[in-house]
């Protein structure tokens, strides 16, 4: 199985929503659906993993219902016909409340975690490789849908390349053999992370392109600052880290640090007071030489949202901002697995972190 990188998230998509899962489902793929159950209208919502956009072939239909005390229905639809329902009589969702819903695809089943607790496992009734689309409908408002790929080593060449600054727009994938889309970063020597413009189907017959990271603010989730989290397993070639957030209107500076013990292996420091993006490494409290060159103007703007994508390769880190390659930073600390802590601080509000 080839590593296909982590797909860019869908942010604040309108409901009903249908979006492509690039490369289809793979063993180990994790999909997070974050949103809020609407308190007013409707008594149901559903997340569907399906083939195409028609809704006739749904490998996994996850359907919370606020009826009869609350329960969740899981099912499969083949050629328009539903199979037998599997019901879980505990309702982990609450009307009017936010939720964090996470799906893990494994060889035998889907595992579903709700708000940090394993909720249900649903054994595959049809081959999951057929799934190429996720859809969400019903009484729910979405903050984002994000994707995190398994940590795997490529066994075949990764995707073809395109210029760094050129995101790619794909139409809905036709049924049958899937075409692998090109990526933003080149394939050699490590697997890539794709950053693309998603084509989203908001409702039947309405097709429109939306940037992978549109400039939007989110009421939640709000991360406390400074934000510190462990990077499980540390860095390794093909590892990617995604952050999105909003720069505060009066921002002076913020930083994203990748740390190894007391050392800062990579310090990414946008400075609005200097109109610069400074990169550096700190070893034993001593800073090295700064790197400041940029291929274009300062990509971070006060008061606007942003995404930062950090891809670790064998010799360097590649950094993309808002889906566009910005710079490479050659490793100064080369023991990558020990770089296992992410620290974010300064004048931003974080809305999403994926490590």
């Amino acid at each position: 199985m080839a590593f296909s990188g982590s797909q860019a998230p869908y942010l604040s998509p309108a409901v009903p929503f249908s979006g492509t899962i690039q490369g289809g489902l793979q063993d180990g793929l994790q999909i997070t659906v974050n949103g809020t159950v609407l308190s007013s209208s409707g008594t149901r919502f559903a997340v569907n993993f399906q083939t195409g956009f028609s809704g006739n072939d749904i490998a996994f239909h996850f359907n919370p219902r606020f009826e009869d005390g609350g329960y969740v229905v899981c099912n499969t639809r083949q050629n328009g016909s539903w199979g037998p329902e599997e019901r879980k009589t505990h309702m982990p969702f609450q009307k009017g409340m936010p939720f964090d819903l996470c799906f893990l695809v494994q060889s035998s089943d889907f595992k579903v975690m709700v708000n940090g607790i394993l909720f249900v496992q649903y054994f595959h009734r049809v081959p999951f490789h057929r799934v190429d689309t996720i859809s969400v409908n019903g009484s729910v408002q979405l903050s984002y849908i994000s994707f995190q790929n398994p940590r795997t080593v490529p066994v075949q060449p990764a995707f073809s390349t395109v210029p760094f600054s050129q995101p790619v727009c794909f139409p809905p994938r036709p049924r049958g053999r899937r075409q692998k889309p090109p990526g933003v970063w080149p394939a050699n020597p490590a697997p890539i992370t794709q950053t693309v413009i998603h084509t989203v189907q908001s409702a039947p017959g309405q097709m429109f392109s939306t940037p992978a990271i549109p400039p939007m603010m989110y009421p939640h989730p709000a991360y406390p600052m400074p934000f510190i989290t462990t990077i499980l397993g540390g860095l390794y070639p093909s590892k990617s880290i995604l952050l999105s957030g909003t720069v505060l209107p009066s921002a002076q500076r913020f930083h994203i640090n990748l740390c190894s013990g007391n050392h800062i292996a990579f310090h990414l420091n946008p400075r609005f007071d200097e109109n610069a993006v400074v990169r550096n490494t700190q070893i034993d409290n001593s800073w090295g030489s700064e790197e400041r060159s940029l291929p274009r103007k300062m990509p971070f703007v006060r008061g606007q949202s942003f995404s930062v994508w950090i891809l670790c390769e064998a010799h360097c880190l590649k950094v993309a901002v808002d889906g566009q390659h910005l710079f490479e930073y050659y490793h100064r600390l080369r023991n990558l697995p020990t770089i296992n802590r992410l620290e974010v601080g300064g004048d931003i509000q974080l809305t999403h972190v994926q490590t």
Epitope: P98, N115, G116, I117, Y223
Partner: antibody
């Protein structure tokens, strides 16, 4: 370094209240689920409650439902357990523990625990 | 509630012995099971997470396995520092999302 430190335990009369605190360092409580687990003298471990600040959700053991409230202040990186209508059978050492972090949801286990704080309910 | 029935409640063993502790879940809990070691007056320590994964820093003599709803903690060669109480714990969403086994006290023979 990840650390959890509980405080707020003590002697309280039946029907009284206590508020336990669990101060976290080395990670953010908003990216984890925080659990309270108690252990009565000479007994086993009993799960009490958990909070998942990331989506403002919580859950309670049947034995404490309606009496205990779990909360978190992400600006202080601290979780709390407000215990009301305390009974003799609530006497225990109360531990807070970190469950899965947001970036490693599929790791099922409580990897860091506090040292515990003793709550004694007695007249 | 999902019950975790742990056995035995206590056992006596010698240094170098192979020790096996089992937990049976009252319904499927997937692999959402952890094992902990607790010594008197101390907080529990995570040994095994996700049924069979060894937590970092834990000696390799500890291992976990799963067969359906049966979960096993094995200590391949008991060491003096292993005399303690061991607990299994499941985390599968139910009326109580977390439950512990009753504990197994491993004593010196």
């Amino acid at each position: 370094e990840v650390q959890l430190v509980e405080s707020g335990g003590g002697l309280v009369q039946p029907g009284g209240s206590l508020r336990l605190s669990c101060a976290a360092s080395g990670f953010t409580v908003s990216s984890s689920s925080i659990h309270w687990v108690r252990q009565a003298p000479g007994k086993g471990l009993e799960w009490v409650a958990y909070i998942y600040p990331y989506s403002s959700s919580s859950s309670y053991a049947d034995s404490v439902k309606g009496r205990f409230t779990i909360s978190a202040d992400t600006s202080k990186n601290t979780a709390y357990l407000q215990m009301n209508s305390l009974r003799a059978e609530d006497t225990a050492v109360y531990y807070c523990a970190r469950y899965s972090t947001y970036s490693s949801k599929w790791v099922w286990g409580m990897d860091y625990w506090g040292q515990g704080t003793l709550v004694t309910v007695s007249s | 509630d999902i019950q975790m029935t742990q056995s035995p409640s206590s056992l006596s063993a010698s240094v170098g012995d192979r020790v096996t502790i089992t937990c049976r879940a009252s319904q499927s809990v997937s692999s959402a099971v952890a094992w902990y070691q607790q010594k008197p007056g101390k907080a529990p320590k995570l040994l095994i997470y996700s049924a069979s994964s060894l937590y970092s820093g834990v000696p390799s003599r500890f291992s976990g396995s799963r067969s359906g709803t049966d979960f096993t903690l094995t200590i391949s060669s008991l060491q003096p520092e292993d005399f303690a109480t061991y607990y299994c714990q499941q985390s599968y969403y139910d009326s109580n999302p977390i439950t512990f086994g009753q504990g197994t006290k491993v004593e010196i023979k």
